[in-house]
């Protein structure tokens, strides 16, 4: 039995913390979808649709499920082992530098620019200068003409909210 698993096979980060007085390193953690009881003896299930845990843990409580905000759609519900996956509604996007809210995508590019990327749940439309091909970022000046386009359809889920 060359690949026999023993206590020694556990990587240091997989072993229970030394300050936890438990009988064996393998018994100090609870599996995904659970948290540990206060006395450290039992594993207690997270509540389906209410909270979750994604990794082996010694948490005293599971993590609260994310509730999708208005302006977001729920791509997949919260289970005991996975948080809710929320995505910005069509026509809106979430930027890395402002992940707390979905922002409206621009409806078109400024004059002298051409659209090369659609609105997605994780990015605004992408505009480049017709001649130079350099990207333009920032708001569309109110006085300039814009080339309008309809928002693109989502291709894949964006990051979790919350």
């Amino acid at each position: 039995e060359s690949a026999l698993i023993t206590q020694q096979d556990l990587a240091p980060q997989q072993r229970a913390a030394p300050q936890q007085k438990r009988s064996s390193p393998s018994e100090g953690l609870c599996p995904p979808g659970h948290h540990i009881s206060e006395d450290g003896r039992d594993c207690i299930s997270c509540k389906y649709g209410q909270d979750y845990s994604t990794h082996w843990n010694d948490l005293l409580f599971c993590l609260r499920c994310t509730r999708c905000d208005s302006g977001e759609v729920e791509l997949s519900p919260c289970t005991t082992t996975r948080n809710t996956v929320c995505q910005c509604e069509e026509g809106t996007f979430r930027e890395e530098d402002s992940p707390e809210m979905c922002r409206k995508c621009r409806t078109g590019c400024p004059r002298g620019m051409v659209k090369v990327g659609d609105c997605t749940p994780w990015s605004d439309i992408e505009c480049v200068h017709k001649e130079s091909g350099t990207k333009h970022s920032g708001e569309v000046p109110a006085v300039e003409e814009t080339v309008t386009s309809s928002p693109g359809t989502p291709a894949s889920p964006c990051s979790l909210s919350g």
């Epitope: 023993t6 299930s45 389906y48 289970t79 082992t81």
Partner: antibody, heavy 119, light 107 residues
Framework: KVQLQQSGTELVKPGASVKLSCKAS????????IHWVKQRSGQGLEWIGW????????KYNEKFKDKATMTADKSSSTVYMELSRLTSEDSAVYFC????????????WGQGTLVTVSA | DIVMTQSHKFMSTSVGDRVSITCKAS??????VAWYQQKPGQSPKLLIY???TRHTGVPDRFTGSGSGTDYTLTISSVQAEDLALYYC?????????FGGGTKLEIK
């Protein structure tokens, strides 16, 4: 298709030990916990504990802590449970089971191994 | 440990009848209840989990309900092949525990 194939019937003497096996197939062996369940003749079901092949994490029901020892062999996708110091109370059918991702209910069951302890 | 009590060890019914098998937990198990069917000489088979979710391939005449401490497995129209032992199990807290079983007999 998920399958759990258990070893055959065992007739053992009191005081001896026996090692049962549960060979898993049809899924990634290291991603799911294997549980063991005891059923005495004409009686209910008792959860013995779990073994997680991914890292060797074990959880025993306190009642079976001094009775059962779980190990695994990743190369053959097999989990083992050794029962020691056998008495007539250990005569039972032992099942290995596998849960699904979102809860520790037994979605898949082995066919069971009958252990008879008799002099 | 959480005790799961199935008050009826036996239940007698006729083909086509509606039957309800009950299970009571000694404490709130937050709907983390599964139901199994076991026929003689076979391994148990999962019917219901999370109190009311039907497992793949289970006929829709089997339904689960309940919350807190009280749970029920209902067979809406009993068939001859439903003659079996039925167990509830809490998958809320270790050690996971099973009810004593209810044997469904056909009149």
């Amino acid at each position: 298709k998920v399958q759990l194939q258990q070893s055959g019937t065992e007739l053992v003497k009191p005081g001896a030990s026996v090692k049962l096996s549960c060979k898993a197939s049809g899924y990634t062996f290291t991603e799911y916990i294997i549980h063991w369940v005891k059923q005495r003749s004409g009686q209910g079901l008792e959860w013995i504990g779990w073994f997680y092949p991914g890292s060797g994490y074990i959880k025993y029901n306190e009642k079976f802590k001094d009775k059962a020892t779980m190990t695994a062999d990743k190369s053959s996708s097999t989990v083992y449970m050794e029962l020691s110091r056998l008495t007539s109370e250990d005569s039972a059918v032992y099942f290995c089971t596998r849960h699904e991702e979102d809860g520790y209910y037994a979605a898949y069951w082995g066919q069971g191994t009958l252990v008879t302890v008799s002099a | 440990d959480i005790v799961m009590t199935q008050s009826h060890k036996f239940m007698s019914t006729s083909v086509g009848d509606r039957v309800s098998i009950t299970c009571k937990a000694s404490q709130d198990v937050s709907s983390a209840v599964a139901w199994y069917q076991q026929k003689p000489g076979q391994s148990p088979k999962l019917l219901i989990y999370w109190a009311s979710t039907r497992h793949t391939g289970v006929p829709d005449r089997f339904t689960g309900s309940g919350s807190g401490t009280d749970y029920t497995l209902t067979i809406s129209s009993v068939q001859a092949e439903d003659l079996a032992l039925y167990y509830c199990q809490q998958h809320y807290s270790t050690p996971y525990t099973f009810g004593g079983g209810t044997k469904l007999e056909i009149k």
